[in-house]
Interface confidence: low
């Protein structure tokens, strides 16, 4: 029979693996098998025999299995033996690549290539490549032979450069045992180089500026170079140098900035191997927003008018408004806010609305207040000019200038001008008590002259509404002056003469100077002194005069300024007729009687009759009353011839009678000598 062993002669097994040796016979039906080592040490294996085949299994393979194994087959009396040598090795894993730290450009790093659990070490070789470049190689042939598993390493120190990015680091381990098939005797590990760059060149760009206004916005962008690309972190330096983290984005946008947002902002670029930071200081300045009140810092409002106060915030996007009075009295108006404007409407203003109104505008937690003074006034009508009478040249006249319903009258000034000349000016500065409407009067007296005609009387009322008002409110009334001149130099012309013969015509013409031109009024003066109007014509004409037309005729020149009167006596002369001389009780009387001698003439006045008593010594004119002469107690010497003569420029008549007076004792007549 024959014996075979498999594998033949020599085999190699990896520690820890399973290894089977098979011994088989041919030409023997039921052989007996036995196994032993050449030096009779323990088998350290299991035997399983089945028919003509016996299998020695080493599981797991260990150092104790490194022997020559002998298989003996007995068939009957025949015995055959075969041996096989078992070599062991250990090369279980790919090498490991280790770094002393991250691969940072420019910083030396140590690379270690480890071959773990190697046996036999003296046959080990380790190569380290960077890309195609062999960096280091080591053979461990000089190592002492020991029956143990060892880990061997190869170290290289190099300084990474940017060009190393993407290159491969190859660690290759070889175990030089001839029987090992090629896939087992060489192992390698490939590691792509992860090269790092610590953050650097960290820069901040700020838009629009590092100096900002309240309420504004700023965008700060941070960039930092490095590998891997640095992560960006934003923070703000607090007083104690502690950094307050704000954001993890490259861009930091701050909106609606306040002054307290001023400070140092820090941007930090961070990656696995380092950090780099940059700082910027932001200065948030207060936004110079302005509060404007219109119509102005002082508003004059007429009683009953509507006042609209507008408060505007200029340079503030979203202001908040509030209105109050300086004395915090109730606000009588309606407030309406719209965007950057607020209006306070005071409808039908009265004295109670006279205040300082304050508009407070809050913008970004900052408040500005602006004031306007509402001054209520009443000045509804033009002044009224009244005069005590018509204007007469040379005659004093009192002028009243009345300004009705004024408030506040302690700011009132009334001026009265004649042409360009101020006649009087009055300031009403007395203390005001309760607020009320008052009527104020300026009164003055002046003497008009004819030269004032054509000029005007101007009453100028000024209401000074407040200290800040440049121009006072002004009202005026103008009254043209027309100065009257009282009639004067009234003259009467009588044509042909004031003494006329009855039946003659006569014209009485009157003229009078004055302004306006006087109206002429002819009148006749009656016996009781009253005037009887006759005509308003300049000329009074008598076509045929009668004795009754004789008398005093009065011409009056009349205008608004007065009356000028002139009179003329018209004498209508007649030739005396029908003269009668009578005595009462008779022509012959007793001594002591009362005697009345009367002379009448039908067509002439009694005043034109002369009574005389004839005597040797000359005629004696008697004092007659209405043509009558009364002797109270007749005396003897009253006896005589009495003569009555009626005489005019145009003729005369004479009558006479003899009075006889009888004596009481002698009872004889007494005749005056004649």
């Amino acid at each position: 029979f024959k014996i075979e062993i498999s594998p033949e002669y020599k085999t190699i097994a990896q520690i820890g693996d399973s290894m089977a040796l098979t011994c088989s016979t041919t030409g023997c039906e039921s052989p007996l098998f036995s196994w032993r080592t050449q030096i009779d040490s323990p088998l350290n294996a299991k035997v399983r025999t089945e028919g003509s085949k016996s299998v020695l299994t080493m599981e797991p393979v260990s150092f104790e299995n490194e022997h020559s194994y002998l298989c003996t087959a007995t068939c009957g009396s025949g015995k055959l033996e075969r041996s096989i040598h078992v070599d062991i090795y250990s090369f279980p894993k790919d090498p490991e690549i280790q770094f002393s730290g991250p691969l940072e450009v420019g910083k030396p790093v140590t690379v270690k290539c480890l071959a773990p659990d190697i046996y036999p070490v003296y046959r080990l070789e380790i190569d380290l490549f960077k890309g195609d470049q062999l960096m280091n190689r080591q053979e461990f042939s000089s190592e002492e032979m020991t029956k143990s598993l060892e880990t061997k390493s190869l170290e290289v120190t190099f300084t990474p450069v940017i060009e190393d990015i993407g290159k491969a680091l190859v660690c290759r381990a070889k175990l030089h045992i001839d029987q090992i098939d090629s896939t087992l005797k060489e192992r390698e590990t490939v590691k792509e180089l992860q090269v790092y760059i610590s953050p650097r060149n960290t820069t901040i760009s700020v838009h629009p500026s590092t100096r900002l206004q309240e309420g504004g916005a700023v965008t700060m962008t941070c960039s930092s170079e490095g590998l891997p690309a640095p992560e960006i972190f934003w923070g703000r330096k607090l007083d104690n140098e502690v950094l307050q983290l704000l954001s993890g984005n490259a861009t930091l946008t701050l909106i609606a900035m306040r002054m307290e947002d001023s400070g140092v902002y820090v941007c930090e670029g961070v990656n696995l191997i380092g950090r780099d930071k940059a700082e910027v200081e932001l200065v948030v300045q207060e936004k110079p927003f302005i509060v404007d009140i219109s119509p102005g810092s002082q508003v004059a409002a007429q009683v009953g008018d509507s006042v609209v106060l507008t408060c505007a915030a200029i340079g503030c996007d979203s202001p908040s408004f509030s209105w109050r009075t300086q004395t915090d009295s109730p606000l009588n108006g309606v407030v309406r806010n719209e965007g950057a404007k607020s209006t306070l409407v005071l409808s039908s203003v009265g004295f109670e609305d006279e205040h300082s109104y304050l508009c407070a505008v809050t913008c970004l937690q900052r408040t500005l207040e602006k004031r306007t003074q509402v001054e209520v006034y009443s000045f509804p009508e033009d002044p009224v000019i009244k005069m005590s009478g018509p204007l007469v040249h040379g005659r004093p006249v009192t002028v009243n200038c009345t300004v009705p319903n004024v408030y506040p009258f302690d700011h009132l000034e009334i001026e009265l001008l004649k042409g360009e000349t101020t006649l009087m000016k009055k300031y009403f500065l007395e203390e005001m008590g309760i607020k009320s409407l008052e009527t104020k009067i300026l009164e003055t007296t002046f003497i008009p002259t004819i030269e004032d005609t054509g000029k005007s009387l101007v009453c100028l009322a000024r209401l000074h509404s407040g200290e800040m008002e440049s121009e006072p409110k002004q009202r005026q009334s103008v009254q043209p002056l027309y100065v009257n001149v009282a009639p004067k130099e009234t003259t009467i012309w009588v044509s042909p003469s004031p003494i006329l013969e009855e039946g003659s015509p006569v014209n009485l013409t009157c003229s009078s100077d004055g302004i306006p031109a006087p109206k002429i009024l002819w009148s006749r003066q009656l016996n009781n002194g009253e005037l009887q109007p006759l005509s308003e014509n300049t000329t009074l004409t008598f076509m045929s005069t009668k004795r009754d037309d004789s008398g005093i005729y009065v011409c009056e020149g009349i205008n608004e300024a007065g009356i000028s009167r002139k009179s003329v006596e018209l004498i209508i002369q007649v030739s005396p007729k029908d003269i009668q001389l009578t005595v009462f009780p008779s022509k012959s009387v007793k001594e002591g009687d009362t005697v009345i001698i009367s002379c009448t003439c039908g067509n002439v006045p009694e005043t034109w009759i002369i009574l005389k008593k004839k005597a040797k010594t000359g005629d004696m004119v008697l004092k007659s009353v209405d043509g009558s002469y009364t002797i109270r107690q007749a005396q003897l010497q009253d006896a005589g011839i009495y003569e009555c003569e009626s005489k005019t420029e145009v003729g005369s008549q004479l009558r006479s009678l003899t009075l006889d007076v009888k004596g009481k004792e002698h009872n004889k007549d007494y005749f005056s000598p004649e």
Epitope: S262, V283, Q285, L368
Partner: nanobody, 125 residues
Amino acid sequence: QVQLQESGGGLVQPGGSLRLSCAASGFTFSSYYMSWVRQAPGKGLEWVSGINVDGSNTYYADSVKGRFTISRDNAKNTLYLQMNSLKSEDTALYYCATGSGRDSYDCYSGSWCPKGQGTQVTVSS
């Protein structure tokens, strides 16, 4: 804490000069408009003068224009008011205040707008 400390006031004859100073602390002085205001006896506050953050723009009330000069030194956190040709009407307590001012009610009616204790200026013969 915002603090403003005025100094430099005193008694001066009409036509004389004074220089007021205001030392500021507790805030970024260079970021603020500043003003001088005054209060005459028995009267309200009156704005006198204002200056912008870097001193390039100055503002004056009509009553002091041509006589007073406002200036600032941001490095020293100090505001100044040079007062020349002083008149008796300039007698008042002078304050420095933050804020742009421009009229009596712009700045000093709100607590947000701090002002100092004041320095007395008396103009009298």
